[in-house]
Amino acid sequence: FYDIETLKVIDEEWQRTQCSPRETCVEVASELGKSTNTFFKPPCVNVFRCGGCCNEESLICMNTSTSYISKQLFEISVPLTSVPELVPVKVANHTGCKCLPTAPRHPYS
Amino acid sequence: FYDIETLKVIDEEWQRTQCSPRETCVEVASELGKSTNTFFKPPCVNVFRCGGCCNEESLICMNTSTSYISKQLFEISVPLTSVPELVPVKVANHTGCKCLPTAPRHPYS
């Protein structure tokens, strides 16, 4: 009924859009909840985060397992009291993802 | 002052976080602004969209050039009146990106 080659292409596309860990760019200061007086150089790092599509609209692509990876960055605090310091910054790296239903919010929360 | 190897690693990390076209997953129906009774299988496709970091917080990673790529998808209308149709769907694909400042909104717009 449908051309087998086209179906194969569509299926491959679908596999690639599935919920999975994807390399993404995160802003370190906001990730760590740092004040505006602390910033990092570079301000962003590459880590894996869950992303992609689920086959039901009511499901959300969420992480099921996480590792923490250390990135060497310059931490700059303002007012500058010393030379920018090279610090290891631990950032969450999603290693497993799954399409999960959203938990209903508690009616009294 | 700082270990040259560490600086090289940091610089490479920074290059990889820069604003550039990145493969991302977009939901076709919302992309095309389709009504809720039209949906696609697969619901998502992979295209390139601008993403990443800028070296000033006030700049935004925006597309400077776009191509439109055609993806073959099944379009399903509810209620189902016929067999799902294989249709070519044109989706925006960012081919160039730049960190750009925002312009003020026209006071009368």
């Epitope: 150089k41 301000p43 | 070296n55 917080e57 006030s58 935004i60 400042p101």
Partner: antibody
Framework: EVQLQQSGPELVKPGASVKMSCKAS????????MHWVKQSHGRSLEWIGY????????YYNQKFRDKATLTVDKSSSTAYMQLNSLTSEDSALYYC??????????WGQGTSVTVSS | DIVMTQTPLSLPVSLGDQASISCRSS???????????LHWYLQKPGQSPKLLIY???NRFSGVPDRFSGSGSGTDFTLKISRVEAEDLGVYFC?????????FGGGTKLEIN
């Protein structure tokens, strides 16, 4: 320590061009945008535009689009601004300024340009 | 372009007094990312401007705590709690939210 060392004063004739430099030290030159600002009459400050030394991308204030050209030489960590078709209106002090992540934070000492016949 | 209006133009003070400078923008300075890029600079006689306060209320490196910034939207204030001789000069507010970046006309802080 972050330092921006600008070239010396310029006395030029109307219609001529001038190219001033701004040598950066004490930080990673390609990691920060370099902005340029014009100060006339000792008070008024006007933003000219900026350049990203990493890739050479520029963004100009519409007003200075036909007046200024911003370039960089990564190998010497130096930013340049060329001003063309000079008139008396262009007589001013010109600053290069490093843009930190949140604001323009370090200013050069300025290059004075005087246009006179 | 966003117009930045500073008042007063000139501010005569006695050493030890409090000083307050106002800056008003012709449009809101809230960026689409939620931040407000309103900064204050001080230009001492014969020197280039120096950053004092960034993003409304954050003191830059080496800036004494007698300097404080406040405000939101379109109205901002720089306060100096106890003026010292080294604080004299011209104060500029500047917006970094939109292009072109624009500056206030300056407020000259001088001794009474």
């Amino acid at each position: 320590e972050v330092q921006l060392q600008q070239s010396g004063p310029e006395l030029v004739k109307p219609g001529a061009s001038v190219k001033m430099s701004c040598k950066a030290s004490g930080y990673s030159f390609t990691g920060y945008n370099m902005h340029w600002v014009k100060q006339s009459h000792g008070r008024s400050l006007e933003w000219i535009g900026y350049i990203d030394p990493y890739n050479g991308d520029t963004y100009y204030n519409q007003k200075f689009r036909d007046k200024a050209t911003l370039t960089v030489d990564k190998s010497s960590s130096t930013a340049y601004m060329q001003l063309n078709s000079l008139t008396s209106e262009d007589s001013a002090l010109y600053y290069c300024i490093r843009a930190g992540y949140y604001a323009m934070d370090y200013w050069g000492q300025g290059t004075s340009v005087t246009v006179s016949s | 372009d966003i117009v930045m209006t500073q008042t007063p133009l000139s501010l005569p003070v006695s050493l030890g007094d409090q000083a307050s400078i106002s800056c008003r923008s012709s449009q809101s300075l809230v960026h689409i990312n939620g931040n407000t890029y309103l900064h204050w600079y001080l230009q001492k006689p014969g020197q280039s401007p120096k950053l004092l306060i960034y993003k409304v209320s954050n003191r830059f490196s080496g800036v004494p705590d007698r300097f404080s910034g406040s405000g939101s939207g379109t109205d901002f204030t720089l306060k100096i709690s106890r003026v010292e001789a080294e604080d004299l000069g011209v104060y500029f507010c500047s917006q970094g939210t939109h292009v072109p970046r624009t500056f206030g006309g300056g407020t000259k802080l001088e001794i009474n």
